[in-house]
């Protein structure tokens, strides 16, 4: 092909090529043609004769102002036609007359201000019609009943001011899953406008200045329709009362989006008319007081998003939002509750009472004063089958005994990014009989004891990154009870002392993060009592991160038991010479990171076993000694391996001898070296 289109599997991509005409030299069997972002002004039908197999044609982002009706005659199998971001202004009855097989027609962002006659009457198979971002002043798309298979009608960002039944009755035989009318200036819903549509399941009126009064009228118009999903995000609905959604009493609404409304007052029984509602989005509002009956009637809601819904008006404590006790008691089916990023004063004794099906609760950054978790904090969740609890970013400084004793079903507890500073007696976790993961990373300090985790033997994941961990060298190890542990993160703790039994019995451990500590002394032969073999017995370990520990020595048998190791990161240490056979047992190794060490020599006797099945190697920024003895074997291996070695050309440079300084390692000439064959 003379054009620079890329063709693969009957798909031709000719986008962004500044084309002024349709290429005439593409394979004739292509089914998808992308001509977007070019300089096409016309689509001559004759140019498409050879592409009769096309099912999808995308000519968006061009300057097409007119369509030849014959185009679709040449493309009898066309199903998807995308004309977005062009300069179409007129659509005649002939324009799409031959496009009878279309299922999708995209006319977004053109200059269509009015639809005359019936340009879409032949589109009996059309499922999606996108006319958003045009200048349409009404929803009138024809004069007779048509588009009986249409499911999505997208009319957002137009200039529609009223919905009238006489304009929408062309959809009398349609079942619209989505009627998208967002970002219009709708001021009127004429009587029966939605009843003119055969069946309407989804209505989207985001960014429409409805306000409480027009919202109420809208809901009355929706009465006795098939409406299931209603989105009224950013519609200036500042208050709701027990009449706002009254009209929805005669519907089976299952999804309601009231996000971004600056909603201030949620009156009692506002949603009493929505017993079928399952998904309720209330995020980014400004509710000052949630009354005990504000959510009354929402018996079937399974998902409720209250993220950033309760925010304080001023610095004054008096202006903090209030949630009455028992406010959630009506939500008997609620499974997922998001209350992130709020300014709620605290947790009251009956705040969550009645949530008998709650499984996921996010309280991240939710409270202004939740400094201490007591044995009363979560009492209102005692009858909830909670599986996941997120308490991050709440400035929690202390967990008292039995704080979670009410949460016997809990599987994941996230306490990260707080200010917890205490000795962990183990009583904090009492009652967590099904716990799977505890995330404690990024806290102030944690002092461990032999019983810190004695009561949670089911724990499989424990995250203790950057918690100024104390007493980790006690014996028996604080981790001794955790025989089911698969992931342990102890990174960023500046740990300098550990015993060889710290990880004893953790035979199921698969991931161990020890990066950014100070473990160098433990592997020195000069260490009193010899090197500490703290990795022994970890026969199922898959990932080991030891980056940034200051290691300048590795004992020869330190990885001996790690038969299943797949990834090892020893980057940013001070390693120079590694003992021969140090990696002999790492037969499963897939990724090895030794970047930014002091390695000068890469010899077969050391690295041969490790490199055998590698898929990724990182040894960048090491001061390689470019001599036959030091790197000949490595260079030959590099040039024959399929292993991915990022930045090989630029960051694997010789340091010595002086005349090779800065020279790329891979270009080192090994032809004069003896016995440097990488594979035998």
């Amino acid at each position: 092909s003379t054009t620079k289109c890329t063709v693969s599997h009957e798909v031709a991509d000719c986008s962004h090529l500044k084309l002024t005409q349709v290429p005439d030299d593409l394979p004739t069997n292509i089914t998808v043609l992308n001509l977007t972002h070019n300089q096409l002004r016309r689509l001559p039908a004759a140019n498409f004769t050879r592409y009769s197999q096309l099912t999808s044609l995308d000519v968006g982002f061009n300057t097409i102002s007119k369509l030849e009706p014959e185009l679709c005659q040449k493309l009898p199998m066309l199903k998807v036609l995308n004309l977005q971001h062009n300069e179409l202004s007129q659509l005649s009855d002939k324009t799409f007359a031959f496009c009878t097989n279309l299922t999708e027609l995209h006319l977004m962002s053109n200059s269509i201000q009015k639809i005359k006659n019936n340009p879409f009457v032949k589109q009996k198979n059309l499922i999606t019609l996108d006319l958003s971002h045009n200048g349409l002043s009404s929803t009138k798309l024809g004069t007779q009943v048509q588009l009986e298979n249409l499911q999505e009608l997208l009319l957002s960002n137009n200039k529609i001011q009223a919905l009238k039944s006489e304009e929408l009755d062309i959809f009398a035989n349609s079942s619209l899953k989505k009627l998208e009318l967002s970002s219009n200036q709708i001021k009127e819903f004429s009587p029966g406008c939605f009843h003119a549509i055969g069946r309407l399941f989804g209505l989207f009126l985001n960014n429409v200045q409805l306000g409480p009064s027009l919202t109420e009228k809208l809901c009355l118009e929706l009465a006795n329709t098939s409406i299931r999903n209603l989105s009224l995000s950013n519609s200036q609905l500042s208050t709701t009362s027990n009449t706002t959604f009254l009209g929805l009493k005669w519907t089976n609404l299952t999804m309601l989006d009231l996000s971004y409304n600056n909603l201030n007052v949620v009156g009692n029984d506002s949603f009493a008319w929505l017993p079928q509602l399952e998904y309720f989005f209330l995020e980014y509002n400004n509710i000052q007081h949630l009354f005990s009956h504000s959510l009354h009637g929402l018996f079937n809601v399974r998902y409720l998003n209250l993220k950033r819904s309760f925010t304080k008006q001023s610095i004054s404590l008096a202006s903090l939002p209030k949630i009455d006790d028992f406010s959630f008691q009506w939500l008997k089916c609620l499974e997922h509750l998001n209350m992130e990023d709020n300014d709620i004063p605290g947790i009251k004794s009956n705040m969550f009472t009645g949530l008998i099906n709650l499984k996921y609760l996010s309280l991240s950054n939710s409270f202004t004063s939740l400094r201490t978790l007591t044995n009363e904090t979560f009492v209102s969740l005692a009858h909830s089958p909670l599986h996941i609890l997120n308490l991050t970013k709440n400035k929690i400084s202390k967990i008292e005994s039995d704080a979670f004793s009410w949460l016997g079903h809990l599987e994941v507890l996230d306490l990260g990014l707080n200010e917890i500073g205490q000795e962990l007696t183990g009583q904090e976790w009492r009652g967590l009989e099904n716990i799977f993961e505890i995330y404690l990373s990024y806290n102030k300090y944690l002092q461990l004891t032999r019983n810190s985790f004695a009561l949670v033997p089911s724990l499989q994941r424990l995250m203790l990154r950057r918690v100024a961990l104390k007493n980790v060298d006690s014996s028996p190890s604080p981790f001794q009870p955790l025989r089911n542990l698969t992931i342990l993160d102890l990174s960023n703790n500046n740990i300098a002392n550990i015993n060889d039994d710290m990880l004893e019995g953790l035979e199921k451990l698969e991931i161990l993060d020890l990066q950014h500590n100070n473990l160098a002394r433990l592997w020195k032969h000069a260490n009193p009592g010899g090197p500490i073999y703290f990795l022994k017995g970890l026969s199922h370990l898959h990932i080991l991160n030891l980056e940034s520990n200051g290691f300048d020595e590795i004992p020869v048998e330190v990885f001996k038991d790690l038969f299943e190791l797949k990834i090892i990161d020893l980057g940013l240490n001070n390693l120079n010479t590694l003992p021969a056979s140090v990696f002999n047992n790492q037969v499963s190794l897939k990724s090895l990171n030794l970047q930014k060490n002091l390695i000068t020599s890469v010899e077969k006797k050391v690295f041969g076993p490790a490199f055998r099945n590698l898929t990724e190697l990182d040894m960048r920024f090491n001061p390689f000694d470019c001599t036959c003895e030091s790197i000949a074997w490595f260079v030959n291996w590099i040039n024959e391996t399929h292993t991915n070695i990022p930045e090989l050309s630029s960051h694997y440079l010789c340091n010595t001898p002086p005349h090779y300084h800065g020279f790329p390692v891979r270009l080192f000439d090994t032809s004069s070296c003896k016995d440097s064959a990488p594979f035998e």
């Epitope: 005994s401 007696t425 183990g426 009583q427 009492r430 004891t449 032999r450 019983n451 004695a454 009561l455 033997p457 014996s475 028996p476 001794q480 009870p481 025989r483 015993n499 060889d500 039994d501 004893e504 019995g505 035979e507 017995g537």
Partner: antibody, heavy 119, light 107 residues
Framework: QVQLVQSGAEVKKPGASVKVSCKAS????????IHWVRQAPGQGLEWMGE????????NYNEKFKTRVTMTRDTSISTAYMELSRLRSDDTAVYYC????????????WGQGTLVTVSS | DIQMTQSPSSLSASVGDRVTITCRAS??????LAWYQQKPGKVPKLLIY???TLADGVPSRFSGSGSGTDFTLTISSLQPEDVATYYC?????????FGGGTKVEIK
């Protein structure tokens, strides 16, 4: 199933030493600490110390620290408790015990070894 | 070292009676307390751990309560086979001391 089998009864003279063995089976010997507890005739139970069979690390009860030595032989899954400078009030049944999945309890005990100290 | 004080040192009760034994620690041991039953000439048998959790195979008439320093073992309806000496033991920090024992007899 977990079993701890101890050596037979011993009679010792004051000033002598006694070495009691505890052979473990039914689990990986090196993964659980072994504890030693004694009980004088008609008296209560007294915790003497614990040993990590994996590396031999020991935590002793200060009361016995100068006289007791705990060791192990991983090749035969056996722990030992040796008490030296025996006195008549060391006459007792000596038990080895092991924690369970919950490390704050002794669900597993040896059958006990009676050590009699008599001149 | 934490001392464990058990009371009473002995008690006599009738079959079917509710029996209560208490154990007091000289310091906070949280809930790291176990109760054992020992019959004459036998090995101690675990009844309860973590103050209130019943060990496998132990009849439900046995129950434990308490936290911190004060703990209780209760036999809701004394049976002839419950004649034994009962010991508490803490597991907070070494040495893991035992209480002096409570001898339970049938009237």
């Amino acid at each position: 199933q977990v079993q701890l089998v101890q050596s037979g009864a011993e009679v010792k003279k004051p000033g002598a030493s006694v070495k009691v063995s505890c052979k473990a089976s039914g689990y990986t010997f090196t993964t659980y600490w072994i504890h030693w507890v004694r009980q004088a005739p008609g008296q209560g139970l007294e915790w003497m110390g614990e040993i990590n069979p994996n590396n031999g690390r020991i935590n002793y009860n200060e009361k016995f620290k100068t006289r007791v030595t705990m060791t192990r032989d991983t090749s035969i899954s056996t722990a030992y408790m040796e008490l030296s400078r025996l006195r008549s009030d060391d006459t007792a049944v000596y038990y080895c015990a092991r924690v369970g999945v919950m490390i704050t309890t002794f669900p597993y005990w040896g059958q006990g070894t009676l050590v009699t100290v008599s001149s | 070292d934490i001392q464990m004080t058990q009371s009473p040192s002995s008690l006599s009760a009738s079959v079917g009676d509710r029996v209560t034994i208490t154990c007091r620690a000289s310091g906070n041991i949280h809930n790291y307390l176990a109760w054992y039953q020992q019959k004459p000439g036998k090995v101690p048998k675990l009844l309860i751990y973590n103050a209130k959790t019943l060990a496998d195979g132990v009849p439900s008439r046995f129950s434990g309560s308490g936290s911190g320093t004060d703990f209780t073992l209760t036999i809701s309806s004394l049976q002839p086979e419950d004649v034994a000496t009962y010991y508490c033991q803490h597991f907070w920090s070494t040495p893991f001391t035992f209480g002096g024992g409570t001898k339970v007899e049938i009237k």
